[in-house]
Each structure stands twice: as C-alpha cells, then as structure tokens.
C-alpha cells in the first residue's frame, strides 16, 4: 500500500502570453498520494468548473482559455489539496496580446483659418501601439504647431490654408500595424477684403467704377450698399480666380453717397462678413454754389427728429448736389453703423453726430453752422464712447481695415471752439446734461447753445480761439 | 501710451520764482488741453489754471491771477508752470493734469516746491 | 467763482458699509462734475465723469447720482482698498473747483 504523500507542484505555472481569440493553457503538474483536488483562480476569484470559456481537464491539471479577450488579462493560480499536509500553490501571469486596433477614427473636419483643429485616433493594443499620421502621402512631421496627443489624436494649433488635405493615422505594435481611413482636414478662411473700394470726388453725371477685391474660404459673395441701402442703380461685374472675388460696380452720379462693398462668406450655420466704404461726392459746379456754402432751413428728416431741437434751423451744406438728401443719407448709414456699439456710447454718439451732421444755423448774409462745443466732442469720444475708440484708432495704427464707427462722419474735437471760451459760438448736448438714472428714453432731445450763466472770461486771462477753419466732414 | 513727466522737486526761498514744466508724449500734444493743479502738505487739491497747448491761451484761477504764467513749446511738447513772489504756502505737490473733466484724464508724477528761508 | 461744498470733511467706517459723499455747488453746474479717488503719495483718479458715469476699469460699487446742485458720490459695499481721500470737481466753467475732500478712514 503507497504511503500518503502531500501534493508538490513539479511544473510551476509560467507567464503565458496569448493573443486575442486564441487558445491559452496553464499546466500545473502535481505529484501526490491520494490524488488532489486542483482548483483554479484568476486574481484570487475561483474559476466555477461549469464556466463555458474555459476547459479543465487532465484532472484539473490544465486550465485552458478557449478563446482569449482582453478582459482575461490577470494572474491565474492553481491550488493542489489532498489533505496530507497543506495545500499548495503556484501562480502565472496572462499576458493578453493584441494587435493594433483603431476605436475611434478620425472624422472628417472643416475648420476656420487660425483655431485649434483636433482630429481623433484612440487606439487598443498590446503592447500599447505607438501612433503616426500621414498627410496625403507622406508622414506628418510634428512641430511647434502639429503635436501627435499622449492619446494618438493629431492636434494643430493655429490652422493654416497648407494644413487642408487627406489624413490617416497609423497605429503599430509588435505584432502589426493599423490603418484609418482618409479623412479630410478643411481650412476655411474668414471673408478679407483685399482691395478697398477708393473714395471719388466727381462732377455732376459722371460714371465711375468702384472695385472691390475679397478673399475667403469658401469664396466670398460681395454685394454693395448705398447710403444703407441696396444698391438701387448701377451694373456690378464680377469674375473669382483662385479664392478671390472681384467685384466692379459701375455708377452714373446724380447725388453724393457712400458706397459699403460687404464680402461675405458662410461658415456651417455662421456667416463672416467684411466691410469697406467710399464716398462718392460732386465737386461744385457753379461759382454761385462756391461763393455760398450753405442755407439753413428747418430739419425735414427723420433719423435725428427726436435727437433735433424742435423747428430748429440746421446748416445744410451745398457742396451736395442735394443737401437735404445727402445730409439724411450719411446719418442713415451712421446710424446702422451704431447698432454694434455699446448702449453707453451710442445715445451720445447719436447726440453727437446729429448735431454735427445738422448743425445749428445762424441765417444771415452769409449762413454760419455753428459746431459743436469741444468738450461734448470729447465726452462722447472719450467717456461715453472710450472702447469703441480706441479699438477702432488701435485697427487704424495697425493698418488693419477699419470697420464701424471709421465710416462716421465724426468732428475732430480739437479743431472745435470751447464752450468756457465763447458760450455762444458752439452747440451743447443736452443729451450729457440730463441726470441719466431717472430717463430711460430721450424723446426729444434738443441740441441748444450754452446758456449765458457761463462767464466770459476776461480776455486777458482766457483767450482760447474759436477755429474760423471748421468745416464739415 | 499717454505720458506726462514733470521736472524735479525745486526749493525756493521767498520772493522767488519757480517754473515746473510737464513734458506730453503719446499723443498729440496740440489737441488737448493742459491743467495745474496743487496740494499743499496735508491739504485739498486746487485748480490753478488752464493752457491751449495750441496757441498758448490760458485762463488762470482768481488766487494767483498775476503770479502765474503758463506756456507751451510745441516743439518739445512741453507745457510749462511759472510761479513768481512764492510764500511759504505755495510749498505744495504741483501736477499738470490733461483734460481734467471733459476727455481721458492723465496726470503728471507731481512736483514737490518748497519755499523755506 | 462757484464754490463746492463736501461733506462729510472726514468720516470712519467699516469693511462691506455703504457710504455716501455728498458735494453742493454754490450754482447750477448742471451735470459737470468728476469724483476723484487719492491715496496718500499718489496721484488723483478719476472715479465717475459727468455726474454718474463710471470711468472704465473702475469696480461698479461706486456710483454717482444728482445735478444742478446737488450731487453724491455712493460705495455700496466699502473694500479695504477704498479707504483714501475723495474729492469732487466742477468743470462747467472756469475756474473749475473742486471740493475740500472727504477723508474715509478705518473704523
């Protein structure tokens, strides 16, 4: 009869490596007397004996995986008891290999010129797969604007136009290499006016064609405003070459304007659009028009009705074929300009190029407007309207194109006389002297002269000029 | 960006006189108006008077009508304060100031002017 | 000459108080009138142009209200930082005057 012998394992389990959907076996060999019961672990959970993924046999002395998953990767143990002595163990690693896998591809982007273009390339794999791309048909070099991420994505930092084209990203492991399909990268570029429409000072009946060049991506459309209004007269030509649109519109002038060419281009559900002006204006044509400037006559029109004084008599400059009209023309298209600026700034900014555009009038022999007094010129500019300003002088510096409020026709305030000087020779904005936290509207805002309480100073203290040279804009 | 550097302190003996000038840079040095203002140790500010860079007009407050005189050299963009007969309570700081009320203001670092026998 | 009139000419109180500087000019200046910030060994700023605008970059716990006559500048919710000298100017004619100043100090 054999002597009870207690179980030694004599083939410790190794570290087995197995590549996704293969077979995996662990043999654990015991030597014992009776013979053992084996039972098996995985990261110390028992392995049930009826869980169909695996197959035990030889007496439990091999475990095998019948079809590896990811998932299996762990440390699998077998455990010998006959109960002679104690139970032994021995214990091996699952290594799960994979072949590079892409779970999520990148897509197909559209993007504007200057933001930040991520395209996706999450990848499976053991070992883990080191990720390249590819542009067209060479291998994208990165640099300080084109990183590859820890997570295989390919980012570009501040897209250019030369970034568009075909991409795919490559994942490789030891045991192979993946690829995604092509995707397209496409750079879209916000509508840019090259060439600026030129400003024309023509003589009554005149053609004259004014151009406007803008470049974008997709290709923009150009359409031309007059006075803030669709071009009503006039033939527009138009011919794109390689991204850039030309647009020539063609005019027979009966009265001054100011002509806004508007390139515009679509960007998914959102629009870029650019903008420059010109002024169309008639040289004088007669010397009694040279000779008077000007007639004063009642306001008749409606953008500065409420902004006015009542009956009031305005300066209406003749150097227009038809002042009235080409007067009321620039204050529409001043006021759209307004729309985009703050509530702060825009009721004194209204106040301010009313009564500039109308200025009160003196009749007489010679009819004189009188303008308005520097320091409400100043306020607005630099109070009321203190952003807007400098955003617009900074652009100007830059030599960027100016948009907004460069098309006003705004007064240089130093070239205005002071209203400390002589009360009577400049006009107020009653608009600044209301106390503005019990008003929410300004129905009838009135422009009036500095009222009398203010002290002539004695000339030899306060002599400040009133500019002689003032003129309109 | 706009900058107005004054002169150094000065000290003066009683009688004398002291001119503080106020040199502009940032902007343009004709299409503003340029203020003085003082502050006696311990003391409130006080409006001394006003200078048109262009042209040189002036108006000066009742209290040193006679005493002061402001000028401007648009050469150098420098707007300058002269104070004659001083008495020792016209020690005090002396700021040019730029548009005090109306537009963006900007102020000078200050002059201290001592007047001490 | 028009005269202004501060008061209180100094006051004490504390952090998150809301205080109130009141100035009176001797005539109509309608809305003309700056309130301006000191604290020691530095120059003035300018808190509220025309009456009741706040001057950019300055916090919206100040504010300023009243024309004609009679005019106050408002901290809603005093800070340790505004513990300092403030002082109102009248700019509807020469000679502009300010007020004698209104030192707020620490409770």
């Known amino acids: 009869e054999k002597l009870p012998k207690a179980p030694v394992i004599t083939t410790p389990l190794e570290t087995v490596d197995a590549l996704v959907e293969e077979v995996a076996t662990f043999m654990c060999a015991v030597e014992s007397y009776p013979q053992p019961e084996i039972s098996w672990t995985r990261n110390k959970i028992l392995i049930k004996l009826f869980d169909t993924r695996y197959s035990i046999r030889e007496n439990g002395q091999l475990l095998t995986i019948l079809s590896v998953e990811d998932s299996d990767d762990g440390i699998y143990c077998c455990i010998a008891n006959n109960g002679v002595g104690g139970a032994v163990e021995s214990c091996g690693a699952l290594q799960v290999k994979m072949k590079p896998k892409i779970t999520r591809p990148p897509i197909n982007v559209k993007i504007i010129e200057g933001l930040k273009a991520v395209l996706p390339c999450t990848t499976m794999g053991n070992p883990k797969p080191s990720v390249s791309w590819i542009k067209g048909d060479n291998a994208l070099r990165e640099n300080s604007r084109i990183a590859v991420l820890e997570s295989g994505s390919l980012r570009i930092h501040n897209v250019q136009k030369e970034d568009a084209g075909q991409y795919r990203c490559v994942a490789k492991n030891s045991l192979g290499t993946a690829y995604s399909k092509l995707v397209k990268l496409e750079v879209e570029v916000f509508a840019r006016i090259l060439r600026a429409p030129e400003s024309h000072n023509v003589t009554f009946g005149s053609f004259v064609t004014l151009r406007c060049t803008a470049i974008g991506i997709p290709v923009p459309t150009i359409s031309w405003i007059e006075n803030g209004n669709a071009v009503s007269s006039g033939s527009i030509q138009e011919s794109v070459k390689d991204r850039v649109i030309d647009s020539r519109l063609q005019l027979f002038i009966t009265k001054p304007g100011l002509y806004t060419c508007i390139a515009t281009n679509k960007h998914g559900e959102k629009f870029s659009t650019a903008k420059a002006a010109a002024t169309v204006s008639i040289a004088e044509w007669s010397k009694s028009q040279k000779d008077s400037q000007g007639y004063c006559a009642q306001y008749r029109g409606e953008v500065c009705d409420a902004v006015l004084a009542k009956d009031a008599l305005v300066f209406f400059n003749t150097s227009y074929r038809d002042p009235e009209d080409a007067q009321e023309l620039l204050i529409h298209t001043a006021w759209n300009e307004l729309k985009a600026v703050s509530p702060l700034c825009r009721p004194a900014a209204e106040a301010l190029l009313c009564n500039h555009l109308f200025q009160e009038c003196s009749p007489g022999v010679v009819p004189t407007p009188m303008p308005i007094c520097r320091e409400y010129c100043l306020a607005v500019k630099e109070l009321f309207c203190a952003k807007e300003w400098q955003a617009m002088e900074g652009k100007a510096h830059r030599g960027l194109y100016r948009s907004g409020m460069h098309l006003l026709p705004v007064p240089e305030c130093s070239k205005l006389p002071s209203m400390h000087r002589d009360p009577t020779a400049c006009t107020r904005l009653p608009y600044l002297d209301y106390k503005k936290e019990n008003i929410t509207t300004f129905p009838s805002i009135t422009s009036s002269r500095p009222s009398a309480d203010i002290p002539n100073l004695p000339a030899s203290t306060s002599s400040f000029a009133v500019s002689p040279a003032y003129s309109m804009t | 960006q706009v900058q107005l550097v004054q002169s150094g302190a000065e000290v003066k003996k009683p009688g004398a006189s002291v001119k503080v000038s106020c040199k502009a840079s940032g902007y343009t040095f004709t299409s503003y108006y340029m203020h003085w203002v003082r502050q006696a140790p311990g003391q409130g500010l006080e409006w001394m008077g006003i200078?048109?860079?262009?042209?040189?007009?002036?108006s000066y407050a009742q209290k040193f009508q006679g005493r002061v005189s402001m000028t401007s050299d648009t050469s150098t963009s420098t707007v300058s304060m002269e104070l004659s007969s001083l008495r020792s309570e016209d020690t005090a700081i002396y700021y040019c100031?730029?548009?005090?009320?109306?537009?963006?203001?900007?102020w000078g670092q200050g002059t201290l002017v001592t007047v001490s026998s | 000459d028009i005269q202004m009139t501060q008061s209180p000419s100094a006051m004490s109180a504390s952090v998150g108080d809301r205080v109130t500087i009141t100035c009176r000019a001797s005539?109509?200046?309608?809305?003309?009138l700056a309130w301006f910030q000191q604290k020691p060994g530095k120059v003035p700023k300018r808190l509220i142009y025309i009456a009741s605008n706040l001057q950019s970059g300055v916090p919206s716990r100040f504010s300023g209200s009243g024309s004609g006559t009679e005019f106050t500048l408002t901290i809603s919710s005093l800070q340790p930082e505004d513990f300092a000298t403030y002082y109102c100017l009248q700019h509807n004619s020469y000679p502009y005057t300010f007020g004698q100043g209104t030192k707020l100090e620490i409770k």
């Open positions: 100031a730029r548009e005090l009320g109306w537009g963006s203001d900007y």
């Open positions: 200078i048109n860079p262009s042209g040189g007009s002036t």
């Open positions: 005539q109509d200046i309608r809305n003309y």
